[in-house]
């Protein structure tokens, strides 16, 4: 199995309003070159949750130390869930490209549900 | 093609643990999950949990949180099931077992499985 | 839990019979964003492990003889063995894959009559 697989185990992960949730999402290579991003939803309308190269996400953490050599799992933690949350999270790997970097793999996706918070 | 072996039979006394193991040979091991199943004498089938090595974390069934510690060795392609505080409802046949990934990483159903390990718990 | 609920709990068919067995789940294992059911077919025979017959609730495994065929969707599921062979003689069990923990159906033993 030499060419990159995107490995996004959970088909459903269900969080209480106001915990994390984590969601895991690892690569089988480091080949391609190239930055993870997390979306929620598919096609144009995506929405961009995280992106391991540029940007600001408050509400995201990394589960595993992205700069550590070799380090495949590319899994986030997303704080303070609400239910405008719930939808299907998608980890994809993009190559490097000039001057952009173009799409590659995407993994399966993971839903996203959010329960009403426990009284 | 791949094939998963495991340890021999044991037989532990009540309260003491059992750790079973599992080397994979012939493919891939740390971005396949191996899951742990085991069979009471003339029972069903019971999933424990199951680790992916390639994140570390195992993932255990609720019934068996706590007394359950599933690990993996990747420099040796083998995942290791240990369970504590053995009881007699604990003889059974463990075995584990390949989950089979499709594209985008997710797990079908087990797809190549051990030949099994028999524990049998007596005083 | 997913709870998986499997009837009937023994079957006894003629030589070159449809045997049938069904498979019910406490709540739909159908994954929508790719519109497959995560529930897999097992068959087992005495002192062996477990062999996957059919995953996706109706993709037969490779080297599965065709006479083995599963359906159903959300919630209800079924195993068919269109021509019973003495070599089907055997133990079927379905599990869910949607949800951990991984839930199996409490078997359905399969025989000759």
């Known amino acids: 199995e030499d060419e990159l697989q995107v490995i996004q185990p959970e088909k459903s992960v269900s969080v209480a309003a106001g915990e994390s949730a984590t969601l895991r999402c690892a690569m089988t290579s480091l080949i391609p070159v190239g930055p993870i991003m997390w979306f929620r939803g598919a096609g144009a309308g995506r929405e961009l949750i995280y992106n391991q190269k540029e940007g600001h996400f408050p509400r995201v953490t990394t589960v595993s130390e992205l700069t550590k050599r070799n380090n495949l799992d590319f899994s986030i933690s997303i704080s303070n869930i609400t239910p405008a949350d719930a939808g299907t999270y998608y980890c994809v790997k993009f190559r490097k490209g000039s001057p952009d970097d173009v799409e590659f793999k995407s993994g399966a996706g993971t839903e996203l549900s959010v329960r009403a918070k426990p009284s | 093609q791949v094939q998963l072996v495991q340890s021999g039979a044991e037989v532990k006394k009540p309260g003491s643990s059992v750790k079973v193991s599992c080397k994979a040979s012939?493919?891939?091991?740390?971005?396949?999950?191996i899951s742990w199943v085991r069979q009471a004498p003339g029972q069903g089938l019971e999933w424990m949990g199951s680790?992916?090595?390639?994140?570390?974390?195992?993932n255990y069934a609720q019934k068996f949180q706590g007394r359950v510690t599933i690990t993996a060795d990747e420099s040796t392609s083998t995942a290791y099931m240990e369970l504590s505080s053995l009881r007699s409802e604990d003889t059974a046949v463990y075995y584990c077992?390949?989950?089979?990934?499709?594209?985008?990483?997710?797990?079908?159903?087990?797809?190549?499985w051990g030949q099994g390990t028999t524990v049998t718990v007596s005083s | 839990d997913i709870v998986m609920t499997q009837s009937p709990d023994s079957l006894a068919v003629s030589l070159g019979e449809r045997a049938t067995i069904n498979c019910k789940s406490s709540?739909?294992?159908?994954?929508?964003?790719?519109?497959?059911?995560?529930l897999a077919w097992y068959q087992q025979k005495p002192g062996q492990p477990p062999k996957l017959l059919i995953y996706?609730?109706?993709t037969r495994e490779s080297g599965v003889p065709d006479r083995f065929s599963g359906s159903g969707s959300g919630t209800d599921f079924t195993l068919t063995i269109s021509s019973l062979q003495a070599e089907d003689v055997a133990v079927y069990y379905c599990?869910?894959?949607?949800?951990?923990?991984?839930?199996f159906g409490g078997g359905t033993k399969v025989e000759i009559k």
């Open positions: 077992a390949r989950d089979g990934r499709e594209y985008g990483g997710h797990y079908y159903g087990m797809d190549v």
């Open positions: 012939g493919g891939t091991f740390s971005s396949y999950a």
């Open positions: 680790i992916i090595p390639i994140f570390g974390t195992a």
């Open positions: 709540q739909s294992v159908l994954y929508s964003s790719n519109n497959k059911n995560y």
């Open positions: 996706w609730a109706s």
């Open positions: 599990q869910q894959y949607y949800l951990s923990p991984f839930t």
